[in-house]
């Protein structure tokens, strides 16, 4: 132990400690609860949740989606490929979660919690992943210009973008949860 430091071990009692899989599962469910809270405000504030004009806004977005080739579905399931996809997807969602930070009035704290808990989930998954080389981190410059572009949209498009981000993130996490339960 370095000087000026004092390391104190916490010993495990008789109960079973949380496993990596259990804790990741709980973390995803934590984020999903956060998304539900945010969606509640979004849907109460505007009629975006019932809107049929989603395609207009979706053209501006390149939100991560699970595809057959990612190996996360029951048919053609591949643990390594899927884990890489989940981590890569979460890293890609980070810029959109940053965009959400100024989009909520009464749920500002919840929006921050969703953003931070996603960062924590990435940490947990990166420890679980063996093939870290295959994980590409989004380019900060590209993210910065995307953020500027999203923030420059008119009010209706910003509301629609918020709705689409939350919906897509929820779907991505639900797919991830199902896949991780097979690992």
């Amino acid at each position: 132990v370095p000087p000026g430091e004092d390391s104190k071990d916490v010993a495990a009692p008789h109960r079973q400690p949380l496993t990596s899989s259990e804790r990741i599962d709980k973390q995803i469910r934590y984020i999903l609860d956060g998304i539900s809270a945010l969606r509640k405000e979004t849907c109460n504030k505007s009629n975006m949740c019932e809107s049929s004009k989603e395609a207009l806004a979706e053209n501006n977005l390149n939100l991560p989606k699970m595809a057959e080739k990612d190996g996360c579905f029951q048919s053609g399931f591949n643990e390594e490929t899927c884990l890489v996809k989940i981590i890569t997807g979460l890293l890609e969602f980070e810029v959109y979660l940053e965009y959400l930070q100024n989009r909520f009035e009464s749920s500002e704290e919840q929006a921050r919690a969703v953003q931070m808990s996603t960062k924590v989930l990435i940490q947990f998954l990166q420890k679980k992943a063996k093939n870290l080389d295959a994980i590409t981190t989004p380019d900060p410059t590209t993210n910065a210009s995307l953020l500027t572009k999203l923030q420059a949209q008119n009010q209706w498009l910003q509301d629609m973008t918020t709705h689409l981000i939350l919906r897509s993130f929820k779907e991505f996490l639900q797919s991830s949860l199902r896949a991780l339960r097979q690992m």
Epitope: A12, P13, P17, L18, D33, G34, A37, K119, V120
Partner: nanobody, 124 residues
Framework: GGGLVQPGGSLRLSCAAS????????VGWFRQAPGKEREGISC????????YYADSVKGRFTISRDYAKSTVSLQMNSLKPEDTGVYYC????????????????????????WGQGTQVTVSS
């Protein structure tokens, strides 16, 4: 463990776990001064990294996580004689429900695991 520090000095306490991963748990730091009740001074959640500090240590103490080492540290600066006591770290899962109250982390929340404590003495 712990140590003798002069007033105004600094000390860093580090909490590690044996038999489980501390990364997955909310961690609180508590202290017990001679003849006094144990008091919660700081905590950090595992779910969204929210932190809390008791008024007595706010601005002087900093709690942080290190995922590489799976530890939680308490950096204590500008130490005062009244900071003297036995310091304990504890780990729990009270932060796993969205909307938990961070300020309750040093009081009403349950902790599953407790460290054995280390003596910190601030004196000239």
């Amino acid at each position: 463990g712990g140590g003798l520090v002069q007033p105004g000095g600094s000390l860093r306490l580090s909490c590690a776990a044996s038999g489980f991963t501390l990364d997955y748990y909310a961690v609180g730091w508590f202290r017990q001064a001679p003849g006094k009740e144990r008091e919660g001074i700081s905590c950090i959640s595992s779910s969204d990294l929210k932190t809390y500090y008791a008024d007595s240590v706010k601005g002087r103490f900093t709690i942080s996580r290190d995922y590489a080492k799976s530890t939680v540290s308490l950096q204590m600066n500008s130490l005062k004689p009244e900071d003297t006591g036995v310091y304990y770290c504890a780990a729990g899962t009270w932060d796993l429900k969205f909307g938990y109250n961070i300020s309750a982390c040093v009081g009403s929340y349950e902790y599953d695991y407790w460290g054995q404590g280390t003596q910190v003495t601030v004196s000239s």
